[in-house]
Structures are given as structure tokens and as C-alpha cells.
Interface confidence: low
């Protein structure tokens, strides 16, 4: 904490610029009028000021909206928001798009910091649901910001907002949240042709059920290694070997060199030894001739 | 109740071979499959493979490629590991594991001290 | 391969304080193939939590797990006299299988 001093003669700040730099602590503190400090927080950004004096320039703030910035005030943080804790962050009530853009430019090239990730959860839940615009934004700036969601708030995606997702938006989503974007998606691209609806819905298909991936067998959509080692372990086990051969389409030799990664790996040691080399790749790993399958989750469904 | 027991400690030359049984009681063996994890003194662990029980399929770690050979007897209820050409830095305390639920390890036998010296 | 790494690799804390250990992966890990091991002196392993965040059988309510992605959490509520041990991460996402180096929580 700063100790609280006079200002020397002489130095009390009429401007926030760049003659601020040569202030120790105590005298920025002492001398610099929290409520000028507000009202030209947009020349904070465009001047050099150390870590410690952006730590006074902070307190000053806090001391002048203890309830949280207004958003006159936060739209100008620039660098100042990195110092700001995700318990500031909460005070705060952030409506704006513009505001959001700002603050996340501020942190663009890093990992999302527990700042950030509290700015946009308030950013949000004032919103009401994860619109179009709002997607558009934090996926251009976090490519991962979907897959950082839980279940449960990804459930307030509006199918409209698919449309804003991007392959690269997905790439570390979990089962979990594909499985509650992947109905969205069906629902946003239902409208569209076959290859067109195929090549939206490919990224969404790590939740896709068995019953859609058979039907998708049926279209000729050659899907590629990439996205069948996504799907679902789960959903790709019933597939039979022909299925998975309509699926893949030329694709299917890519199975040799994935067969010890889930999920083939799994997917062959339910597949018959006959039906594996039926695909001449030498897939090892089935289940012998004369061998007797028994679907143990039926037997226990039943129990 | 469920658990894996492990043959004992062994002493062996640089060049020779160690087998390892595991003898698992109280579950259905053929349902999970036998995991093998090594572990030198001081150090971690280090996965070196596993084999399916009710089919015999195996995966080894590539490091160890060549070298190791996992089996069960189902009859018995017992897995096995043969390690081949023992160097001195196999010398480790050897477990293995069931693969259990999410193929997370969820028994362990005691494990088997394996010292290869010369 | 995958590689695991734990941090920190000592954790000096005493009985009843919170523990919190990290686990980070090479390459993104789904959270259903991420597990947390313990391991005293002298005795095998024992699974503590699989899938990320589900306990295993018998396992105190204590332990919990978190993260996504490449970044994955150990934490223990309040330290037990019993809990000072090794703690290691595993991935089998992808194979080879791999452990993380270990984190030892040792009495202060």
C-alpha cells in the first residue's frame, strides 16, 4: 500500500502524459486526481508507465469506483487491465462489443488468463446467450474459447450461432462438448445439399451418434483419418467393416497407421479377423473365426 | 477381493531373458486386460504395454519393441512378460496393472524387483 | 509421444493445508484419458482419479481433478497424513501410454 503523502509543488498532474513516467510511486499517488485519471484513461495506453506504476495507477481507481469501473473507463484500460483480478472483473458490467474487442486486444497473442475468462462469463451472462457477433469475436481471438466452455454453458449456443464456428474453433473441444454442439449443428446446416451439409458438419462429428454416422456411410463422403479419430469411441464401435469402409471411402488405408489409437484401436478388437482383412490392409487384432461375441452391455440392460 | 500377485524377485546377467507372471483373483479375467509398468529405483513409471485377455492382442511400447513378449493363460487366470537381452538399466521394479475402467489402471500387483548385474 | 509434465516437482506442505498439482500435456489430452496415480514408499501405484475428475473406488472425496485441453489439475482439499506421497499423471489418449515425472508432497 502507498503511503499517503502531499504532492510536491509544482508536480500536481493537470494532463495524464508522459512526464508521469519520472514520478516515483508516492508521488503519482499523491499527486495524480483519480477522477482526471478517469476521464484520460485512453492516454494511460500510449504511455510507457512501469508495472508498479500502473499498480498506483490501479489503486487510484479502485478507490474512486470501489463498486467497479464504469464502462467509460473500462473500454480505456489497455495494458491496465492485465492488472486488474478476476474479483475487479467481476464488480464490473460490460454491455459492449467494442468494450470486449479492446480488452481482449490487450491480451491477443497470449493464453486466455483468468482475467479474460471472467471479462467474457460476464460478458455473456449479460448477454443473455453466446450470439452470432459475440462467437465471431472471441473465436477470432481464442480459437479454443468454445472448447473452454462447459456443457452446460455451451447449451446456451443458438443453432443461428454455429454459423460463426470455425474447424479450427473445435480442435480441442472434449467428448462432452461435442456431443451438445454437434445437434446445434445438425439443426443450423439441415437445409444444405449433401457434399456442402458434409464439409459444415465435419468438424461438429466428434458427437455424432452411431445411427448418423451410418447414415453418412450411405453418401459418399469420404471422411478423412483426421475427423474419424475424433468420433466418438462409443459411436464408432458398431460400425461394421463395410460401414467404415463407406465412410472413409480412399480414406480407409489412413487405418494401418492410426490402428493402435483410439478410437480404431478399439473399433478393431470388435471387428471379426474375416470382415478386417476383407479391407487387405493388414489390420491384426480381431476377434478369431469361431469366436462367440457377446454384447455383455445388452445382457446387462436386460438384468 | 480383486488383486494381481506377482512371482518374485529376480537376479539375471546382462543377455539373459526374465519372465514375470501376474496371477489375478476375485474378477473375470478374460473382461479387462493386464497392463505391464516398470519402475527403475528412484525413477518413475514407465508404461511397456499391454495385452487384451480375451483376445491376446498386445501393444508394446516402441522403446521396447523386439524385446518384450506379453502373454495370458487364460485357464490359469495368470499374465505373463518376457523381457529379452536384459541390460543393466532394465534393472527396475516391475508391476503389473489391470486396465480397468476409462483403461485407467485401477489394480496393481506388488510388483517384482528385476536387478540385472553383471 | 505424448509428453506429461508435472510441476512441482516438490511440494512441502502441512497436514490439513490444500494441495494443488499440476499436470501439463505435449499435445491436447480429451479429458476422459487423463489419469492421477499415488504412490508411498515401497508400494505399487493406486489409482486416485480417472476420466479427469472421477474418483476411483473408495478414493476421499478429498481429491478432486480438473482442466482440458493441455492443462490438468490435482487437488487435494485438506492434506491427511496419509496423502504425503508421489503423485503421478498418465495420458492414454494416444500411444505409447505415458506417466508424468511425479510430484512429491512431502511434510513441511
Known amino acids: 500500500e502507498v503511503e499517503k503523502t502531499a504532492c510536491p509543488s509544482g508536480k500536481k498532474a493537470r494532463e495524464i502524459d508522459e512526464s508521469l513516467i519520472f514520478y516515483k510511486k508516492w508521488e503519482l499517488e499523491a499527486c495524480v486526481d483519480a477522477a482526471l485519471l478517469a476521464t484520460q484513461m485512453d492516454r494511460v495506453n500510449a504511455i510507457p508507465f512501469t508495472y508498479e506504476q500502473l499498480d498506483v495507477l490501479k489503486h487510484k481507481l479502485d478507490e474512486l469506483y470501489p463498486q467497479g469501473y464504469p464502462e467509460s473507463v473500462i473500454q480505456h484500460l489497455g495494458y491496465l487491465f492485465l492488472k486488474m483480478s478476476p474479483e475487479d472483473i467481476r464488480k464490473w458490467n460490460v454491455t459492449s462489443l467494442e468494450t470486449l474487442k479492446a480488452l481482449l486486444e490487450v491480451n491477443k497473442g497470449h493464453e486466455m488468463s483468468p482475467q479474460v475468462a471472467t471479462l467474457i462469463d460476464r460478458f455473456v451472462k449479460g448477454r443473455g446467450q453466446l450470439d452470432k457477433d459475440t462467437l465471431d469475436t472471441l473465436t477470432a481471438f481464442y480459437p479454443g474459447y468454445l472448447c473452454s466452455l462447459s456443457p452446460e454453458e455451451l447449451s446456451s449456443v443458438p443453432p443461428s450461432s454455429i454459423w460463426a464456428v470455425r474447424p479450427q474453433d473445435l480442435d480441442t473441444c472434449d467428448p462432452r462438448q461435442l456431443d451438445v454442439l454437434y445437434p446445434k449443428a445438425r439443426l443450423a446446416f439441415q437445409n444444405m445439399n449433401g457434399s456442402e451439409y458434409f464439409v459444415k458438419i465435419q468438424s461438429f462429428l466428434g458427437g455424432a451418434p452411431t445411427e448418423d454416422l451410418k447414415a453418412l456411410s450411405q453418401q459418399n463422403v469420404s471422411m478423412d483419418l483426421a475427423t474419424f479419430m475424433k468420433l466418438r469411441t462409443d459411436a464408432v464401435l458398431p460400425l461394421t467393416v463395410a460401414e467404415v469402409q463407406k465412410l472413409l471411402g480412399p480414406h480407409v488405408e489412413g487405418l494401418k497407421a492410426e490402428e493402435r489409437h483410439r478410437p480404431v484401436r478399439d473399433w478393431i478388437l470388435r471387428q471379426r479377423q474375416d470382415d478386417l482383412d476383407t479391407l487387405g490392409l493388414g489390420l491384426q487384432g480381431g476377434i478369431p473365426n469361431g469366436y462367440l461375441v457377446l454384447d455383455l452391455s445388452m445382457q446387462e440392460a436386460l438384468s | 477381493q480383486v488383486q494381481l500377485l506377482q512371482s518374485g524377485a529376480e537376479v539375471k546377467k546382462p543377455g539373459a531373458s526374465v519372465k514375470v507372471s501376474c496371477k489375478a483373483s476375485?474378477?473375470?479375467?478374460?473382461?479387462?486386460?493386464i497392463s505391464w509398468v516398470r519402475q527403475a529405483p528412484g525413477q518413475g513409471l514407465e508404461w511397456l504395454g499391454w495385452?487384451?485377455?480375451?483376445?491376446?492382442?498386445?501393444n508394446y511400447a516402441q522403446k521396447l519393441q523386439g524385446r518384450v513378449t506379453m502373454t495370458t493363460d487364460t485357464s490359469t487366470s495368470t499374465s505373463f512378460m518376457v523381457l529379452r537381452s536384459l541390460r543393466s538399466d532394465d534393472t527396475a521394479v516391475y508391476y503389473c496393472?489391470?486396465?480397468?475402467?476409462?483403461?485407467?489402471?485401477?489394480?496393481w500387483g506388488q510388483g517384482t524387483m528385476v536387478t540385472v548385474s553383471s | 509421444e505424448i509428453v506429461m509434465t508435472q510441476s512441482p516437482a516438490t511440494l512441502s506442505l502441512s497436514p490439513g493445508e490444500r494441495a494443488t498439482l499440476s499436470c501439463r500435456t505435449s499435445?491436447?489430452?480429451?479429458?476422459?484419458?487423463l489419469s492421477w496415480y499415488q504412490q508411498k514408499p515401497g508400494q505399487a501405484p493406486r489409482l486416485l482419479l480417472y476420466?479427469?475428475?472421477t474418483r476411483a473406488t473408495g478414493i476421499p472425496a478429498r481429491f478432486s481433478g480438473s482442466g482440458s485441453g493441455t492443462d490438468f489439475t490435482l487437488t487435494i482439499s485438506s492434506l491427511q497424513p496419509e496423502d504425503f506421497a508421489v503423485y503421478y499423471c498418465?495420458?492414454?489418449?494416444?500411444?505409447?501410454?505415458?506417466f508424468g515425472g511425479g510430484t512429491k508432497v512431502e511434510i513441511k
Open positions: 496393472a489391470r486396465v480397468g475402467d476409462s483403461d485407467a489402471f485401477d489394480i
Open positions: 495385452i487384451t485377455a480375451y483376445n491376446r492382442n498386445t
Open positions: 499435445q491436447s489430452v480429451f479429458n476422459s484419458f
Open positions: 476420466g479427469t475428475s
Open positions: 498418465q495420458q492414454d489418449y494416444k500411444l505409447p501410454l505415458t
Open positions: 476375485g474378477y473375470t479375467f478374460t473382461t479387462y486386460g
